[in-house]
């Protein structure tokens, strides 16, 4: 059974992931980003189901495409280079989903824009955090 300290750690990691995803969304999804329209041409795959930490496997598999989109953005939009930002997210995702169980991600049929993709995973983080508090 999860201890209160492990639950707290999970909550903090989810909050960190949430902040990173929100920062990316805010950094790109505004009219001051001249490459927004180009970024919206990128296709992202969405999870069929995202209700548990193991489903973060689906986010992990889309981190490389996410980095490619962020490479279009001006570095001033974020406090870190895209490679470092994605690396940080990857570390959190690996810790949260755990590496001992192998989970095959199932994707929904419909693809999504980067804005829809980020909003989906932001909602996921908020939902899991709410169950932990």
């Amino acid at each position: 059974a999860p201890t209160s300290s492990s639950t707290k750690k999970t909550q903090l990691q989810l909050e960190h992931l949430l902040l990173d995803l929100q920062m990316i969304l805010n950094g790109i999804n505004n009219y001051k980003n001249p490459k927004l329209t180009r970024m919206l041409t990128f296709k992202f795959y969405m999870p069929k189901k995202a209700t548990e930490l193991k489903h973060l496997q689906c986010l992990e598999e889309e981190l490389k495409p996410l980095e490619e989109v962020l490479n279009l953005a001006q570095s001033k939009n974020f406090h870190l280079r895209p490679r470092d930002l994605i690396s940080n997210i990857n570390v959190i995702v690996l810790e949260l989903k755990g590496s001992e169980t192998t989970f095959m991600c199932e994707y929904a049929d419909e693809t999504a824009t980067i804005v829809e993709f980020l909003n989906r995973w932001i909602t996921f983080c908020q939902s899991i955090i709410s169950t932990l508090t």
Partner: antibody, heavy 118, light 109 residues
């Protein structure tokens, strides 16, 4: 309604020309803008992109160093300054608005013909 | 440089289904957009994000994408659909805006 009205095309024996695109019906200063051209009987070719405030500009290789895009947000107007014109620049030039929700151009001007003769 | 490849022309009789394809190496990871351009007019978007229809576009226009191929389908083509159709997307890095060469749709009335 949302509109882009173009002016400034014409016949040019080489040299320079400036195109204008007047925007109305939307907050011009909130949108990145483009120029797209179409040579007679040919397809569409993206030419240049300018950010909402004019601070960032991007050009197709075919016009780099010769064309300059600019904007005056106080006048809701986009410009394309074309220098060192070549015969292959002969085309209909369209101004087009970058969508902030779709990954493409959602509003287009009516187009203006530029003819370059050597 | 990145290219989107379309057939130069497609012909159908009124009421038939017209299919226009667009091929590009980056399309598995890029959305395709479709523009209709009638003679002497500016282009009008008829499909965005592979398969979505902007407001005001008739239901007979639909789009799909699989692998490196995007397809514009006009089910029950009408004489007024006669136009040039261009697919649009960006290269793999997203930096270069690219139009296909265009397809002339003839509706044999």
């Amino acid at each position: 309604q949302v509109q882009l009205v173009q002016s400034g095309g014409g016949w040019q024996p080489g040299r320079s020309l400036r195109l204008s695109c007047a925007a109305s019906g939307f907050t011009f200063s909130n949108y990145a803008m483009n120029w797209v051209r179409q040579a007679p009987g040919k397809g569409l070719e993206w030419v240049t992109l300018i950010s909402y405030d004019g601070s960032q500009k991007y050009y197709a290789d075919s016009v780099k160093g010769r064309f300059t895009t600019s904007r005056d947000n106080s006048k809701n107007t986009l410009y394309l300054q074309m220098n060192s014109l070549r015969a292959e620049d002969t085309a209909v030039y369209y101004c087009a608005r970058d969508s902030t929700t779709l990954g493409a151009f959602d509003v287009w001007g009516q187009g203006t013909m530029v003819t370059v003769s050597s | 440089s990145y290219e989107l490849t379309q057939p130069p022309s497609v012909s159908v009789s009124p009421g038939q289904t017209a299919r226009i394809t667009c091929s590009g190496d980056a399309l598995p990871r890029k959305f395709a957009y479709w523009y209709q351009q009638k003679s002497g007019q500016a282009p009008v978007m008829v499909i965005y994000e592979d398969s979505k229809r902007p407001p005001g576009i008739p239901e007979r226009f639909s789009g799909s994408s699989s692998g490196t191929m995007a397809t514009l389908t006009i089910t029950g083509a009408q004489v007024e659909d006669e136009a040039d159709y261009y697919c649009y997307s960006t290269d793999s890095g997203g930096d270069v805006s690219v139009f296909g060469g265009g397809t002339k749709l003839t509706v044999l009335g």
